[in-house]
């Protein structure tokens, strides 16, 4: 948990953050793990510590190894480990897997590719971007702040993207490159404000005392894979788990995707052995996603076991 892999290329700048976090005012000491030798803080050194950051300006293959950082708060010392590997520059264009940062996915609506680790560096715009080693040219590509935007993304835009920028330290410039894969999602999904299909707003559900009852909360959130969507039940404004009535439980229903492509979710509320006091509760079906929350309220009413209607007025 408190160990982090970092990598870079020889003769480029590499800045590593201690995996243990702390207030900016905390002292952080860095050591070579093997020798326990302290890493200097003087900036005249090629490798030096600067608070939570360890800086290799520039990095050398021999710098590879494990580094220990100790974050010293007034109350605790917390230890972290940075596993650093510096690789020789490749002569050919291929970027090996071990130099790749996490893959990002894009679609027609969202095609941002963030330059990995750039927030650790003192850099100035613009960034240079390359795809499969070719400099990106054309109006479809826009380097904006720390990310690349691709207009009208097509499946052919998938590939390895490298950002290149200059880190400045006390007037000296150092080059940094970072590469990640970009994949294009075919599905043109979208999300919208939740639509609750059931129950109807202010629905009255008839139940029989002593019998079991089920209430289904069903809502749709858009088309395609939804980043964040949930349906749940509340009792008198309280989560089911916090309400503390073991007879009343919620159970996830089917994740539905209808023929029209809508992504919908169900949550079934199961009430065992319905009691009189259950009729006094307010049952809220909640559907929420990034757009917001929609709530439909249901109340229970007593259904007589034999409901004979009088034929007399």
């Amino acid at each position: 948990k408190f160990s982090k892999q970092s990598w870079g290329l020889e003769n480029e700048a590499l800045i590593v953050r201690c995996p243990r976090q702390g207030k900016p005012s905390y002292t952080v000491d860095w050591y070579y793990s093997q020798t326990n030798k302290s890493i200097p803080t003087q900036e005249r050194n090629r490798v030096f510590a600067s608070g939570q950051l360890l800086k290799f300006l520039p990095a050398a293959v021999a710098d590879s190894g494990i580094y220990t950082c100790i974050v010293r708060s007034p109350t605790f010392n917390r230890t972290g480990y940075a596993n650093v590997t510096i690789y020789k520059k490749q002569s050919d264009c291929n970027v090996p897997d071990y130099l790749m940062y996490s893959t990002v996915s894009g679609s027609e609506k969202n095609s941002k590719i963030y330059c990995p680790t750039i927030d650790l560096y003192n850099w100035t715009a613009p960034l240079e971007w390359f795809k499969n080693c070719q400099a990106l040219q054309g109006s479809r590509y826009r380097a904006h702040k720390s990310f690349l935007v691709i207009d009208n993304v097509m499946t052919e835009d998938a590939g390895d993207y490298t950002c290149k920028f200059i880190h400045n330290e006390n007037g000296a410039n150092y080059s940094v490159t970072a590469t990640r894969s970009f994949t294009v999602k075919d599905e043109q999904g979208f999300s919208l404000f939740p639509v609750i299909g059931a129950p109807a707003q202010n629905e009255i559900k008839e139940v029989e005392i002593g019998k079991n009852a089920n209430l289904t909360c069903s809502a749709c959130f858009g088309k395609g894979t939804q980043f964040l969507a949930a349906v749940l039940w509340q009792l008198n404004g309280t989560k089911i788990t916090d309400f503390g009535e073991p007879r009343i439980q919620q159970e996830e229903g089917q994740n539905q995707s209808f023929s029209n492509g809508l992504a919908c979710l169900d949550m079934v509320l199961r009430i065992a052995d319905v009691k009189e006091e259950d009729l006094l509760l307010q049952y809220d079906c909640l559907a929420l996603n990034l757009h917001g929350l929609r709530r439909h309220t249901v109340r229970l009413s007593r259904k007589n076991p034999i409901d004979h209607h009088s034929i007399y007025c």
Epitope: Q21, G22, K23, S25, Y26, S73, P74, T75, F76, R78
Partner: antibody
Framework: QVQLQQSGAELVRPGASVTLSCKAS????????MHWVKQTPVHGLDWIGT????????AYNQKFKGRATLTADKSSSTAYMELSSLTSEDSAVYYC??????????????WGQGTSVTVSS | DVVMTQTPKFLLVSAGDRVTITCKAS??????VAWYQQKPGQSPKLLIY???NRYTGVPDRFTGSGYGTDFTFTINTVQAEDLAVYFC?????????FGGGTKLEIK
């Protein structure tokens, strides 16, 4: 939402011990330190100590060292403080408070409702 | 231990007044100072952290400043709901210590 639910009021005899609990919910228990603070009308707020629930490491105010024992149960997200050899000076309201040290805001950003302890024979 | 000397102990003000509370540390505590508000019958609430940063949801009439040993907390336009005790606290060195508190009363 973040909540720190403390145990109920205690009436204890001098010389006895008391254990107070603080149940955390609405956040990752191990990502924050849990601190304990004593409040009396005369002395105001007094920091007792802190526990890192991730590791179980503790740090105490020398004033309370040896009498206060802080523990944490990760499985139930509950912090405990045991105070021993009680005297009337220990009659106070005791608060548990979450301390954010990894990201802003840095400080005691959420407090329990407090537990009143009365030491009396 | 770092002693946080908070003044004044009491403040009697009218709604709309500007209020200033000071806290003096017995040694430098950098900017590791927080300010808390405690309303009657309630737990303390964080208002200011890192000497001058307003906590989420805190109205902008509350401000903090200072560095080293001298810290100031200001309420620009006091409102009736600001009736409370205000505490400063340092977390620069252990044990963390609090000021004695300032009781704010509204005329």
């Amino acid at each position: 939402q973040v909540q720190l639910q403390q145990s109920g009021a205690e009436l204890v005899r001098p010389g006895a011990s008391v254990t107070l609990s603080c149940k955390a919910s609405g956040y990752t228990f191990t990502d924050y330190e849990m601190h304990w603070v004593k409040q009396t009308p005369v002395h105001g707020l007094d920091w007792i100590g802190t526990i890192d629930p991730e590791t179980g490491d503790t740090a105490y105010n020398q004033k309370f060292k040896g009498r206060a024992t802080l523990t944490a149960d990760k499985s139930s997200s509950t912090a405990y403080m045991e105070l021993s050899s009680l005297t009337s000076e220990d009659s106070a309201v005791y608060y548990c408070t979450r301390y954010s040290y990894t990201n802003s805001p840095y400080g005691m950003d959420y407090w329990g409702q407090g537990t009143s302890v009365t030491v009396s024979s | 231990d770092v002693v946080m000397t908070q003044t004044p102990k009491f403040l009697l003000v009218s709604a709309g007044d500007r209020v200033t509370i000071t806290c003096k540390a017995s040694q430098s505590v950098s900017n590791d100072v927080a300010w808390y508000q405690q309303k009657p019958g309630q737990s303390p609430k964080l208002l200011i952290y890192y000497a001058s940063n307003r906590y989420t949801g805190v109205p902008d009439r509350f401000t903090g400043s200072g560095y080293g040993t001298d810290f100031t907390f200001t309420i620009n336009t006091v409102q009736a709901e600001d009736l409370a005790v205000y505490f400063c606290q340092q977390d620069y060195s252990s044990p963390y210590t609090f000021g004695g508190g300032t009781k704010l009363e509204i005329k």
